[in-house]
């Protein structure tokens, strides 16, 4: 493949038609972006600012507590996944500004857009792990007292990350840079070429493993947890549960458009009008999914304010209060009083 260190003339305004108006000179003047792309840029900018700062703060708060607090381990890993994805945003932003021209080369094309999928799989697998933890705390409190430790939590996170990397491989492998002849533009995208079945298979696996199956299992899981919690009439604040439910719900809300358009595009002919319409919305769907990368710190702050009544504490201490609450009396040998809000009603503190 040719190297792409040349200046790209801007023919963006000819993207959707073959014919150039005889009265329109083929000049290099800049043209306006489509509305979905403008919205995507706004979302990307907000997500980057909130996501980088918010997740950095969460990492900073939870990193100190992760040795002894299991909840901190969960939230630390979620924040790392989100933070990593946010690092790709300036590149994706630049590409959209340049009418989807990709001057960053093949390696960046394979890695950077795949980060959001790595985030998706890592997040949902971590959320599944957290949900399993919440479930065990409610239904197997004795087992938790005996076996629920930081070491096991880290192993679970490592497994989640490993599986996430594995599930991201297809996207990574099929991403290519394509340099179009006219308008002169280098594009970064997936190319399955001869294998439409493989494209559909990847889209179906992504939909099932990254969305439908987790949606079903987590809905069932939290239905049981909430029913048990309400039936016991827990007097203690169930803030970790509320935070986790909010995080899980936001995951599915913000990934929905991406998953729906993705599965539709895999079953449509690339030249069909519906496919072309969905392709125009692609950046917006990706940006909407990217909201996941900044929403968690917002949820934590909102939750913290709710639990505090009003924002009396500093942001780090407010986050620490939300993210490092413990649910079992003796969590590890390094257990200290400071990591627990209250020691009462340990089996109901979910």
């Amino acid at each position: 493949m040719d190297s792409f260190n040349y200046t790209t003339p801007d023919y963006g305004h000819y993207d959707d038609k073959d014919t150039l108006d005889l009265n329109t000179p083929v000049d290099k003047t800049s043209n306006t972006l489509r509305v979905p792309d403008i919205l995507a840029l706004v979302i990307f900018a907000v997500v980057f600012l909130v996501g980088v700062l918010g997740n950095a703060l969460v990492v900073w708060v939870t990193a100190f507590e992760a040795k002894r607090t299991i909840n901190a381990i969960w939230f630390l890993n979620l924040a790392v996944a989100d933070f990593l994805s946010c690092l790709a945003l300036p590149i994706l932003f630049t590409s959209i500004v340049q009418h989807h021209h990709w001057p960053f080369g093949g390696a960046a094309c394979s890695i950077l857009p795949s980060l959001i999928l790595l985030n998706m799989y890592a997040s949902i697998l971590l959320l599944a792990t957290i949900s399993a933890d919440r479930f065990l705390l409610v239904f197997k409190p004795i087992w938790c007292q005996n076996f629920r430790g930081a070491g096991l939590a880290w192993i679970a996170c490592a497994v989640a990350w490993g599986l996430a990397l594995l599930l991201t491989i297809p996207s990574f492998l099929y991403r290519v840079v394509r340099e179009e002849y006219f308008p002169p533009k280098v594009l970064c995208g997936v190319d399955y070429s001869h294998d439409k079945r493989r494209e559909r298979a990847v889209a179906i696996v992504r939909l099932v493993l990254g969305f439908l199956w987790p949606l079903l299992t987590l809905t069932i899981c939290y239905t049981f947890i909430l029913l048990r919690t309400w039936s016991r009439r827990a007097t203690r604040s169930t803030k970790t549960l509320k935070v986790v439910v909010a995080v899980v719900a936001s995951f599915f809300i913000f990934w929905l458009p991406y998953q729906v358009t993705g599965i539709m595009m895999s079953f449509l002919e690339p030249s069909s009008p519906t496919f072309l319409l969905l392709k125009k919305l692609d950046s917006l769907c990706v940006s909407f999914a990217y909201i996941n990368c900044c929403i968690n710190p917002i949820i934590y702050v909102v939750a913290g304010q709710g639990f505090q009544g009003r924002l009396r504490k500093s942001l780090p201490s407010l986050l620490r209060n939300v993210l490092t609450e413990e649910s079992v009396v003796r969590e590890s040998k390094s257990f200290t009083r400071s990591t627990v809000d209250t020691m009462a009603q340990k089996t109901q503190a979910v």
């Epitope: 003339p9 959707d16 014919t19 005889l22 083929v26 179009e180 002849y181 594009l187 399955y192 072309l276």
Partner: antibody, heavy 121, light 112 residues
Amino acid sequence: QVQLVQSGAEVKKPGASVKISCKASGYAFSNSWMNWVRQAPGKGLEWMGRIYPGDGDTKYNGKFKGRVTITADESTSTAYMELSSLRSEDSAVYFCARFLLISTVTAVDYWGQGTTVTVSS
Amino acid sequence: DVVMTQTPLSLPVTLGQPASISCRSSQSLVHSNGNTYLHWCLQKPGQSPQLLIYKVSNRFSGVPDRFSGSGSGTDFTLKISRVEAEDVGVYYCSQSTLVPLTFGQGTKLEIK
């Protein structure tokens, strides 16, 4: 009517350079890409590069990068292709061909008559 | 680079009979704007190539209607409903979706 008239045949020694011209008429020279394609004896067609005469913007096939230079003179509606460091395998017929931007065709639609270049010591 | 593979490379045909040439690309030729820039040209003996079909199925001006093109994505076909003597030459498929522009190896049509 569209016409692309190329310069005459050339015989060159290995290591030398050759510069071929292609004079266009019958259409708006500026609103097109001028492409250069070569065909070795008994072989297929191979794209070398293109130029947008309006501003001199060029794109080359990576295979020829560094050896080929495409230029254009808007005032005479002429495109030029220079190939340096010639070797025997560069012996071929060289065609100029236009890609008109203001038509629905969006294909290389008209070709020059070809210029035969022979590289021999 | 996009590799264009033509079959057959040689095609002996009886006058008045139909002929078909296949072209397969190593990558999808669907442009980001939805169009497919796959073309067919004919190089008659001792002449320059001439455009026959552009964008898969559109006949270029002056091309007889016995020539037709079809296909999508990566698989394309040129059909001649009734071969005439003047159709003799080498047929090339080419793509102008991606840089560099690439051509098939050519299919030599000859009269039996």
